[in-house]
Amino acid sequence: QGGAAEGVQIQIIYFNLETVQVTWNASKYSRTNLTFHYRFNGDEAYDQCTNYLLQEGHTSGCLLDAEQRDDILYFSIRNGTHPVFTASRWMVYYLKPSSPKHVRFSWHQDAVTVTCSDLSYGDLLYEVQYRSPFDTEWQSKQENTCNVTIEGLDAEKCYSFWVRVKAMEDVYGPDTYPSDWSEVTCWQRGEIRDACAETPTPPKPKLSK
């Protein structure tokens, strides 16, 4: 997704507009400590990474503090002084929002309103997936804010819910990542349950963006 050159595969993730993680997979340099050099401005000198990720004792990535930046990350992955991959990327197009926090459920007869804390930046979709033991697939509903009302539920059934946040593709493009799912919460007759007892092993949720 971040590109490949000279056998180097790159992945970029911008965690919640706070931290950028650049990882690489370089089969040609599998036993080499590649170094990561970067800048956030085209005019600055390159800085070297101070927070490397290691895999089997060798560098495999870098974590950078990048609070609320919408600029370009210029970077070079080097073997000694030799650049093996050089690129520049707008960081926001690799956004991974944080998982929803303070998820709450408000029941009213056959409907539930799921709310959580909206993130501080926009152009996001808040997706609720839910299913009862009688559903073969997860159902899904999403809104622009974390205030999602699901109607037509059966008060007698137990439902499992979880929530995640996604970046709008028309704004951020196709290379973003959905947030991690919130914890699964089970409800029946407007009351929280430890689990939906008769639930078979749930199928994988739909991961479509």
Partner: antibody, heavy 118, light 106 residues
């Protein structure tokens, strides 16, 4: 309809200044990085400058660094290029263009002509 | 800086021909390449991005391929509206255009 409309081009003497504007409509301007690209008469395309969606970060080709300044006013949906110390080689049609997810420039204006001549 | 070399510079073809334009990067750019069409007096129009993704609204006779340093734009059956100049653009590190390929009538 998504549209970009440049203005401000004209004839200027070497060493002079000019300010170009680009009015955006039909999309949420404040969400996207923007660029200026130029094309000298009978020549190919040359990227000139870019600015991030918030306007907080700017980027320039070496050929214009220190002479040109890109800026934007998201409240007015307008992109600007202030050109100082103009040279004959800056003569070109100047296009503003919208960034497409860091892959390319997807929407272009019709261009405005800048002629630097004594 | 990354240099982009297009070939040929000029290409004479007839309606219905299959046309291929190549673009070579001076270093690997993965698939960070776009193709544009420009007609005289008009702004460039995006055809292909990320080497092979067809921009919305662009006819399917246009296709792109390649990765690394070698890229190709193919027009499967040239139409009268396709006579124009075509440019490649690398967007891997900064932005650099190829010098252009003019497709004219044979």
């Amino acid at each position: 309809e998504v549209q970009l409309l440049e203005s401000g081009g004209g004839l200027v003497q070497p060493g002079g200044s000019l300010s170009l504007s680009c009015a955006a409509s039909g999309f949420t301007f404040s969400r996207y990085g923007m660029h200026w690209v130029r094309q000298a008469p009978g020549k190919g395309l040359e990227w000139v400058s870019a600015i991030s969606a918030s306007g907080g970060s700017t980027y320039y080709a070496d050929s214009v660094k220190g002479r040109f300044t890109i800026s934007r006013d998201n409240s007015k949906n307008t992109l600007y290029l202030q050109m100082n110390s103009l040279r004959a080689e800056d003569t070109a049609v100047y296009y503003c263009a919208k960034d497409k997810w860091g892959y390319a420039f997807d929407i272009w204006g019709q261009g405005t002509t800048v002629t630097v001549s004594s | 800086d990354i240099q982009m070399t297009q070939s040929p510079s000029t290409l004479s073809a007839s309606v219905g021909d299959r046309v291929t334009i190549t673009c070579r990067a001076s270093q690997s750019i993965s698939n960070w390449l776009a193709w544009y069409q420009q007609k005289p007096g008009k702004a460039p129009k995006l055809l292909i991005y990320k080497a092979s993704s067809l921009e919305s609204g662009v006819p399917s006779r246009f296709s792109g391929s390649g990765s690394g340093t070698e890229f190709t734009l193919t027009i499967s059956s040239l139409q009268p509206d396709d006579f124009a100049t075509y440019y490649c653009l690398q967007y891997n590190h900064y932005s650099t255009f190829g010098q252009g390929t003019k497709v004219d009538i044979k």
